[in-house]
Structures are given as structure tokens and as C-alpha cells.
Amino acid sequence: GSGIFQLRLQEFVNQRGMLANGQSCEPGCRTFFRICLKHFQATFSEGPCTFGNVSTPVLGTNSFVVRDKNSGSGRNPLQLPFNFTWPGTFSLNIQAWHTPGDDLRPETSPGNSLISQIIIQGSLAVGKIWRTDEQNDTLTRLSYSYRVICSDNYYGESCSRLCKKRDDHFGHYECQPDGSLSCLPGWTGKYCDQPICLSGCHEQNGYCSKPDECICRPGWQGRLCNECIPHNGCRHGTCSIPWQCACDEGWGGLFCDQDLNYCTHHSPCKNGSTCSNSGPKGYTCTCLPGYTGEHCELGLSKCASNPCRNGGSCKDQENSYHCLCPPGYYGQHCEHSTLTCADSPCFNGGSCRERNQGSSYACECPPNFTGSNCEKKVDRCTSNPCANGGQCQNRGPSRTCRCRPGFTGTHCELHISDCARSPCAHGGTCHDLENGPVCTCPAGFSGRRCEVRITHDACASGPCFNGATCYTGLSPNNFVCNCPYGFVGSRCEFPVGLPPSFPWVA
């Protein structure tokens, strides 16, 4: 603790100029004071001034008023500083002395004589209010007042609380009269060192280093840091926790960029063709006759179906076609013949059979030839006999199918299972997909072939909804949800009436 006992001398009256021993001062009593402050004593005794002592210079002769003086010699009020907790009680001895010597330091002069003394004992609380008193004896009167105040930066009823106002990163506060801290606006905490963030700033996801600020932690955004940041590249999805990509209805895939309802959203198929939500691009167009192209946007030539028979040549017209028939044939498609077997109409060794009592004929063609007159060599690939993208090749009298990887059989109709050689380690489940086998891994493993043991089981927190099965190892986030029928989304959280497909990657 630290404080100051202050004594203000106001007036001293010694009209007859007498000393305590009854003698008079010549030419008058040149008066100075000695003050002794000590702990409370029921009976004041001589001894050390435990709380401090002070002397004044000569303040006047006989009777005089003492003016306030703030500096230099003769300071008034008198200051008695202490460096301890103020006990609330005290004893004070004020002595008036006459000196024949030096005005400024009279206590050092020989021959000083006591004029009078007063003793005050009692209690005194710390405070700014002056306590005024007056003491009389037969010869003198002293008017004075006194108080105890705390030193700068000390507070409380005993001046025991140290408090220094500050405004830096260890505190932003002023001091209350009791020494407690009063935080400056925008600051809080025991030491007023914690800023009060922008109102509404999310407690966990945001913070601040100065008042009315809201700085977002990684994965969060917005003025109040209450909006999660979805996975980078998330197209048609949202998040409830950072880096998530929960697909909007009708969208799928890791980045929610696969349109599950492309047909409805975009109507890509033209010219009355049928659209189905399937295929590598998310949709397939089935064209009406006379149209071709990925979107059935290309009108076929009217002659594309080879409508002219018996070697007739086809000419496209605006909305139809016209057949130019060879000699001996007539009709819209040159289907009627004016020839008979007598005209040897069958080529390439075809045998002629008469019909309608010899008014027409029919050719029976040898292998590898076709047409009304066996005039066409058979292209065994025209019927697209090769399945699953196989390539058809004419080989003499026969044809062969060259199959894509993963398929076999005469017509590439048989699927070779990539999973047959069990490529998935650690009990992973194998899926035959168009681009090769894919493994879904049991908990604790990841990697293309479930070959990597992971220390953190991403499925442990149960991230999949609606009864979906959780697998690890199929994505950067280390888990996938295999949705049951009727649910989609990275965590199978969206119900849709869509057929089941390969598991959504979370």
C-alpha cells in the first residue's frame, strides 16, 4: 500500500507571545511546527514516529494565518507519505516551537523553546474530505484539518490496491475508486485484454484482435463467420461443415457437377428424339428415323435408307426422294420388273426362278451376294453385329468382331470381369466399371486397391445417412457413402426417385 497523510495548518493564535514555560518570547515567538505521526496509542508516548515526521520553517510570529503553499519551503498542507496499508487509526502530535535561529531550518537551531503541543488519537478513513479541528489551551489556539489520501495508482479503503490505467495489449482499462479495473469500450476479461468481437460473430468459427472485428477461422466465411466454405470446386452443392459438398437435388459426383436430371434441365435432344438420364455424358438421345447425331440434330438424307431396289439410283428431293430405275424396272422403288428369266437378270451366279406365270422372276443368290439381281456383295457389318463398342471387320465370306478391353465372344457380348483376378486388398469389394475395376475399401484402408492402411477411420463418425454403407479409400476425403435405392448426395442425404447407381463419392 501507499498513501499520504496530509495536515493543513490554518491558523495559530498566541496573542501574548508566551512559551509553554510561562516566559515570553523576545521580541515575539518566531513559530515553527514539528509533526509526529505514529500508530494508534491510547496513551501517547515518546518514541519513534512510526508513520513519519516532518518540520516546517518559521511560518509566522505569535499569531498568524497559514497560507496554502504547494512547493518549496513552507509547503502547506504538510505531506507525510507512507508505504504500507493504511490501518485506519493513528496518533498525531503537533508541536509549536519558537526559534531564535534560522527561519528555513529552525529545527537545527540551538535554543529552541516549546510553545505548545496537541495530541490527536483516533480513527481516520481514506478519503478526499478534510477533517477540520481546533485545539485550545490557556495560551494558544491551533486551527487545522487533515486527511489520508492514496498515492497515485493506489486505491481502496486502505490504499492497498495498485492499479495503473493502461491501453496496450496487456490491458485496456481505467481504475475504479476501489482499484478494480474498468474496461475501456470494446474490451472485456479480467485484465480487459480480450476484445469484444463484432456483435453476432460466431464464438467458435470467428475471433478478433480488436473490438468490433470478426476474423474467420479456416473453412468459414461471411461477416459473422457463420457460413461454411464448401469443397473447392463444388458446383451445385452446399455445406454444413467446411470443405463439404452436399449436392443440390438433381446433382451428383464429388463436386456436384454431374447433372442427374440433365434431360429435364437442358432438353438436349432435338427433333422429337427421346432423352434418357444415362450414359457417359449424363444423357443419351434416341433419334427418330431420319435423324442422327449426338443430339439427333442432323437430318439424314432421304436416300440414306436405300429405298430404290433393283439397282435404281436415289435422288433427294425437298421432302422426299425419287428413284431412277434401270432398264427393265419400274415403280416408286423400282420394285416391279419388266424382265423375265429369259433375260438372264441374275448376276454373280444367281439362279432365276419364274413367278406369276413367267411375268416376273426372283433371283436366288449365292453366298456373299444379295440384291434383287444378286448385284450387291454382302457387307456383313451393316447390321452392327458387334456389341459393347466392338469393331466389325469383313473377312472374306465371314466377318469378325474386334472387342474392346473387358469384352469377348463372337459378338463381344460377353463381359470379362476385371474383378476376376481379385485386385482389391484387405477385403475390399471390387466393382467392374467401364474404365476398369474400382475397389471400395473396408474401414481402416484406402487407395485404388485398398493397399494403404489409414490411421484415422473416416467412417468412424458415421457420416452416411439413410442406412447408406460407408467405405474408405475412394476419394481425397477418405470415405464414400454407398447409397440405398432412392437416395443420392455425397452422404446419401437427399431422397430422389432415381435408379441406384455407383456409390456417391463424399
Epitope: 495498485l162 495503473k164 493502461r166 496496450d168 495489449h169 496487456f170 476479461g189 485484465y191 480480450q194
Partner: antibody
Amino acid sequence: EVQLQESGPGLVKPSETLSLTCTVSGGSISSSSYYWGWIRQPPGKGLEWIGDIYYTGSTYYNPSLKSRVTISVDTSKNQFSLKLSSVTAADTAVYYCAREDVILRGGSDYWGQGTLVTVSS
Amino acid sequence: SYELTQPPSVSVSPGQTASITCSGQRLGDKYVSWYQQKPGQSPVLVIYEDSKRPSGIPERFSGSNSGDTATLTISGTQPMDEADYYCQAWDRDVGVFGSGTKVTVL
């Protein structure tokens, strides 16, 4: 008991950047009661405060060094770091990291053992 | 910039009292810490908040601070107290160390 340990190269060439890391053990760097400071002492001279950082990343620098100093914190590693760019021979000193306690009104109650960094070509 | 001034050296006989001053403008309005540093060692906090001792610091170390001067007092000085002593205060957000005082125990 809290311990601080400075680490980094002991020799840096003039005009290059001095980089030091302080690893805190026995306590969390994310406590709200502490700032984490860097102080240096040239050979035979007194202490000079460089700057400090709070776990949230708030930094305070000595104005005489501010243009060259960067202090950063990595709460996941319980570390904080000092970078001092464009060094000269005058930056040769023992560099200390220390914990500054709010409760102690900014007094530094724990110090690293210090690491001598010499700037020389 | 704010400066703290200390006497370069103070000599004291064993068992006597050593007083080290630290002066700065209105220093009494700031909290002062004192550090002891022995050769080849890191500084050790001996006084904080003007006059408080951390646990483990002997009672012979005391501090005061008023006006423009803070004082570290070592009463009953022992040979082991021979060291450099630094005062430290905060001027707004900047830490400021005194120039240091070498205490020699004669």
C-alpha cells in the same frame, strides 16, 4: 513446467533473412493469458525487445525493427517464429524467445536458453 | 521513443543493501519488471508489477516505483547476487528495457 527452445541457423549472410523458431513445451501456446515474444542481446550489450504475438496471430513490433520483422504462430505445432530480413552485422546477437504473462502485467516469466546468430559472409 | 536509464554499475559489500534505479518519464504510471542475468545465462524475472516477487525469488529482492523512478533493492546482498540487472516497462504496445546495471559484490 513450461519450456521454450529456440532453433535455427547460427550463421546468416548479410542481406539475407534470419529465421528462428521457438518451440513451446509443457503448456499450450493457445492460452489467452500469454503473449509470445522475441528479445535479442548483442554480444556484451543490453536486451532489446523485438516483438511479440498472440495465439490468434495479432502481432506487435519494435518500431525500430518493424519494417524488417515478421513474427508468426503455428498453434498446431505449439511454435512461433521470427523472420528478420536484410540483416547486417549489427543484427549479430543472442536471440531469446520468452513468454509474456498478462497476469504479471507483461512480465516475462519463462525464457528460452537463447541462440547465437552471427551475420557474416 | 521511450527510454529507461540505469546506472552502468553498482558496487556493494556482502550483507549490505544495493539499490538500482531505473528512470523514465512518468515511469510511476507504468508497471515495471526487473530481470537478473548472470553471464552465459538467460534473464530471470525477479520483480513484476513494481514490487511483486515471483515464487522462488528470495525476499531480499524488493521493488518500488513512483514519480519518474523505479528502484530494485537487494537487502543483505550475497555474492550469488552478482549479475546484470535490467528494468523493463511497456510503452503502449512496445516493450522497453533499461540499459542494464552490473552489480558487483565486493
